[in-house]
């Protein structure tokens, strides 16, 4: 019930918190799943539990799998498990899907963009703040605390926003970065019934079993902001969430971005450690506005 | 399906024995805290205490300690409620719950029926 | 012993309303409150765990928030088949204790 999907970059420091929550008197154990090996608390890993926290200075790609975090509080034990992947560094400017954070939208009077998972960290001020992997200059942009404001939002503000700050471990520096979506609010909108983008109707993806693999649902609504629009994935039919396989996650918040003027949604589906089993299920990529439903299906073939 | 069934309604004298059953089904009993609420008439819910039939440890609140004891039969998975000596204020509906595992807890989550317990010279 | 209030006692809303309990408790419990639905002459139903999170088969329109000391729960458009006494429970420590029940009728 309480699995939570956590990513980082190799190299990088990834902080992750226990799902379940306890208050900070309260022991909390931390297990690799798969081995039920107990992850140390002596700082001097590279990998350690401090409380409810789990600490990744710096992440390697290895470090991906299914993390266990037990809360002992005075009656019952809380079990939660945080699902880790660890990407490669892209070796271009491109931010792919499954990297973003959820997107924020703004318009003239509100344009704040927090820094996603930054309140995990030990950092000090300033934040820097990129735009499609561009430093961002000028007087518009002020980085204050956690968030960046822009004055005198424009359309072409819009964007994926990365934040980049230093996390402090015992007087060890490490990076990290975390970028999402900014989409800004256009008065001059319509809606239209869903058109999906990703997945085709009816394809079927090739896969490696024991690898990770992410689906994407791609889907546009019309121009400018929305009212309604939300893409999500089903398994059999049946939500995401009340699929009882933490190996299998939808992303938590969806990344909005604009195309041709167009407001598309996509959404991530995260398969850790394929099985055959998962080759059986149907995945449904659904997309649905207020003029309706569309449903594309994807299935797994295992790679010849 | 995961049920918790308890037995049937008992009329008892002041100063009487009695001891009810909860038997679980459609789940692993031994690693599952069983616990017991009472319910007065036209009150509300109060905690008694529960066990873990996987090593029996038990816990109570204090209000029950020593006027009831809460005991477990893993062989054929049932969890007891039993009073020494009936008092009239031990009236009342006594509901079995189900309280998560050794290592997870969500909530009550699955009730007996209810054991309508009624005490009256 | 941590001692839950709960209020109103009871409450009496339309059908379609947006109904709220609180619960109060006399210490901090982190999120370790459970909400519960007892339905006249039935055994009380788990509805809400750890302050927020929805059983499985609830329907949608319950929901709870909160943390620490004060919490709320709402069904945001009342059904006629939600006439039942709500319970707020913590389990942050033994003995495990209720709040007194909050009686909702149909107007």
């Known amino acids: 019930k309480f699995s939570k999907q956590s990513w980082g970059l190799e190299n990088e420091a990834l902080i992750v918190r226990c799902p379940r929550q306890g208050k900070s008197s309260y022991i909390v154990d931390w297990y690799y799943s798969q081995t039920n090996k107990s992850i140390p608390t002596q700082e001097r890993n590279r990998v350690f539990a401090s409380g409810q926290l789990l600490k990744f200075l710096p992440a390697e790609v290895a470090d991906s799998g299914i993390y266990t975090c037990i809360v002992r509080s005075p009656t019952f034990n809380r079990t939660g498990y945080a699902n880790v992947t660890i990407y490669k560094k892209q070796p271009d400017c491109n931010v792919p899907d499954y990297l973003m954070y959820s997107t924020v939208s703004g318009s003239e009077k509100n344009s704040k963009i927090y820094c996603p998972t930054i309140d995990l960290y030990n950092w000090t001020a300033p934040l820097e703040w990129f735009k499609n992997c561009q430093a961002l200059q000028g007087s518009r942009y002020k980085a204050h605390k956690s968030f960046l404001v822009i004055d005198n939002v424009m359309t072409d503000d819009a964007g994926d926003y990365t934040c980049k700050f230093i996390h402090n471990e015992n007087g060890a520096n490490y990076s990290v970065t975390a970028t999402r979506s900014f989409t800004v609010k256009d008065e001059q909108g319509f809606s239209r019934f869903p058109v999906i983008r990703a997945p085709a109707h009816n394809e079927t993806k090739e896969v490696e079993i024991g690898e990770n693999t992410n689906l994407t649902c791609s889907a546009c609504f019309g121009k400018g902001a929305q009212f309604l629009a939300t893409v999500q994935w089903q398994l059999n039919g049946n939500k995401i969430t009340d699929f009882s396989e933490p190996r299998i996650q939808q992303e938590e918040g969806q990344n909005q971005s604009f195309s041709n003027g167009l407001a598309c949604v996509n959404t991530v589906l995260r398969i850790a450690d394929v099985k055959e089993e998962d080759l059986l299920l149907r995945y449904d990529c659904l997309a649905l506005n207020l003029h309706g439903l569309r449903r594309h299906t994807i299935r797994l073939s295992r790679k010849n | 399906e995961v049920q918790l069934v308890q037995s049937g309604a008992e009329v008892k004298k002041p100063g009487e024995s009695l001891k009810i059953s909860c038997k679980g089904s459609g789940y692993s009993f031994t690693n599952y805290w069983i616990g017991w609420v009472r319910q007065m008439p036209g009150k509300g819910l109060e905690w008694m205490g529960i066990?873990?039939?996987?090593?029996?440890?038990?816990r109570f609140s204090p209000s029950f300690q020593g006027q009831v004891t809460i005991s477990a039969d893993k062989s054929i998975t049932t969890a007891y409620l039993q009073w020494s000596s009936l008092k009239a204020s031990d009236t009342a509906m006594y509901y079995c719950?189900?309280?998560?595992?050794?290592?997870?807890?969500?909530?009550?989550?699955?009730w007996g029926q209810g054991t309508t317990v009624t005490v009256s010279s | 012993d941590i001692q839950m209030t709960q209020s109103p006692s009871s409450l009496s809303a339309s059908v379609g309303d947006r109904v709220t309990i609180t619960c109060q408790a006399s210490q901090d419990i982190s999120n370790y409150l459970n909400w519960y639905q007892q339905k006249p002459g039935k055994a009380p139903k788990l509805l809400i765990y750890d302050a927020s999170n929805l059983e499985t088969g609830v329907p949608s329109r319950f929901s709870g928030s909160g943390s620490g000391t004060d919490f709320t729960f709402t069904i945001s458009s009342l059904q006629p088949e939600d006439i039942a006494t709500y319970y707020c429970q913590q389990d942050d420590n033994f003995p495990l204790t209720f709040g007194g029940g909050t009686k909702v009728e149909i107007k």
């Open positions: 719950a189900r309280h998560g595992t050794s290592s997870d807890y969500y909530g009550l989550d699955v």
């Open positions: 066990i873990y039939p996987g090593n029996s440890d038990t």
